[in-house]
Amino acid sequence: GELETSDVVTVVLGQDAKLPCFYRGDSGEQVGQVAWARVDAGEGAQELALLHSKYGLHVSPAYEGRVEQPPPPRNPLDGSVLLRNAVQADEGEYECRVSTFPAGSFQARLRLRVLVPPLPSLNPGPALEEGQGLTLAASCTAEGSPAPSVTWDTEVKGTTSSRSFKHSRSAAVTSEFHLVPSRSMNGQPLTCVVSHPGLLQDQRITHILHVSFLAEASVRGLEDQNLWHIGREGAMLKCLSEGQPPPSYNWTRLDGPLPSGVRVDGDTLGFPPLTTEHSGIYVCHVSNEFSSRDSQVTVDVLDPQEDSGKQVDLVSAS
C-alpha cells in the first residue's frame, strides 16, 4: 500500500484546513491508527492528534477543540483531519504516520500554508496646490502573508514608488503616488489596488484628488461700451474666475466708495439707472485659501448729448 497526501495545503486565515492522509491499501489491509504531528525544522515533533481504529480521536491539549475528523461517512483507511479556524502560527510542516496490518507503518509530510489577506489603508498626502513640484498625492499600505501587490489605477499622470518591510510571518508593502498638481486633476479618482492570493478579488480604495488653485480674474459686461450711457437700466459687471476651494468675490471702487444704489451680489455688480456718477475704476478682488487675484475695469458713462469720444480701459492684475 501507499499513503496519499498533498505536498502543500493552502488555507485562508480563519478557514478550516483539511490535512489529507489516505492509506491506499491492498485488499484485507487494515489501518490501526494514524498519528499526526507537527514537525517544523529545528524543533522536536509535537503530537497533534491520534486517530485510533478502536479508541477513536485523541487531540493534544494545545489543539483541543480545533482538530476533528471529517464528517461521516468516513473510510476506515482515511486518516485525514480537519484543523479548524487556521491561524498564522499553524503554518508549517505536518506528518501523518499510519500504522497498518499486515503491511506495517507508513509516513508522509505536508506543508500547511496560511494565507493572511491584507487590510489595506490609504493615506492622502499633504494638501495639493497648483504650482507645486512633484508632490505626494497618497500612500497605500497593505500587510499580509505572502506579501500583497499594491498598484494604482488612475487617469492622472504620476510616478509610483514602493517599499516592503518583512515581519516574522508577514510583509507590509507601501506604495506612494507622486504627481505635479494641476487644476485638471481636481475631482479625479486615484485608486489603490491590492492583490493577494487570499482575496477572491482585488481590494480597491479610491481617493478623490483636490488641487487648490485660483484662475486669473476678468470682468465681463463692458464688451459694448455704447450700452453704458446715462439712463440705461440693468447694467451689470460680472467677475469671472474659478478656483478650488471655490473663491469669494469682493467689489471696490478704486477712486472712491461704491456709488449709492450699486448692488453687490457675489461675483456680480448691479447698477441702478446709470448716471455720470457711476463712471470710475472698479476692482474685482477674487480670493480663496490658496491665493487671490484682482481685475479692474474703467467704466465711462456716456452722455448721448455730448459728442465726445469714448474710451474703455480694461486692466487685469494679479
Epitope: 490501526g32 498519528a35 503530537e47 485510533h52 481504529s53 496490518f101 499486515p102
Partner: nanobody, 122 residues
C-alpha cells in the same frame, strides 16, 4: 506473549477515590495506545478512557470527564486510571486493553486483562 494485569479495585464510598494500575509485558510498551474499559452487570463493555503511546494525548467518555485521569509510565510499562468523585453508577469490572495494530503475527491483536472490580456503595 502479551500480558496485562490490572490491580487497585475495591469497595469505596460515593465521593471517594481509587487508582487502578495495569502492568503490561510482552510488547514494546511505549509504541501503542492503550485504554480502560468497564462493564457493569447486564450492560455492554464501554470505553472509559484511552491514551496515546507517548502519553500526551488522552480521551475520556463524557460520563467520566473531569473526574477520571488516565496516565502511563513508559519506564515501568504501567497504565493508570485515577478515579475521583466516584458515583454508584461507576460500579463495574474495569479492564485494561491494548490494541497492537502493527508488527509480526505473534503480537498483532487486541489484548485484554482479566479485570478488577470497582464497587461504589455506601
Amino acid at each position: 506473549e502479551v500480558q496485562l494485569l490490572e490491580s487497585g479495585g475495591g469497595l469505596v464510598q460515593p465521593g471517594g477515590s481509587l487508582r487502578l494500575s495495569c502492568a503490561a509485558s510482552g510488547f514494546t510498551y511505549s509504541g501503542y495506545a492503550m485504554g480502560w474499559y468497564r462493564q457493569a452487570p447486564g450492560k455492554e463493555r464501554e470505553l472509559v478512557s484511552s491514551i496515546s503511546g507517548s502519553g500526551t494525548l488522552t480521551s475520556y467518555a463524557d460520563s467520566v470527564k473531569g473526574r477520571f485521569t488516565i496516565s502511563r509510565d513508559n519506564s515501568k510499562n504501567t497504565l493508570y486510571l485515577q478515579m475521583n468523585s466516584l458515583k454508584p453508577e461507576d460500579t463495574a469490572v474495569y479492564y485494561c486493553d491494548v490494541d497492537i495494530p502493527v508488527g509480526d503475527a505473534t503480537t498483532v491483536g487486541d489484548y485484554w486483562g482479566q479485570g478488577t472490580q470497582v464497587t461504589v456503595s455506601s
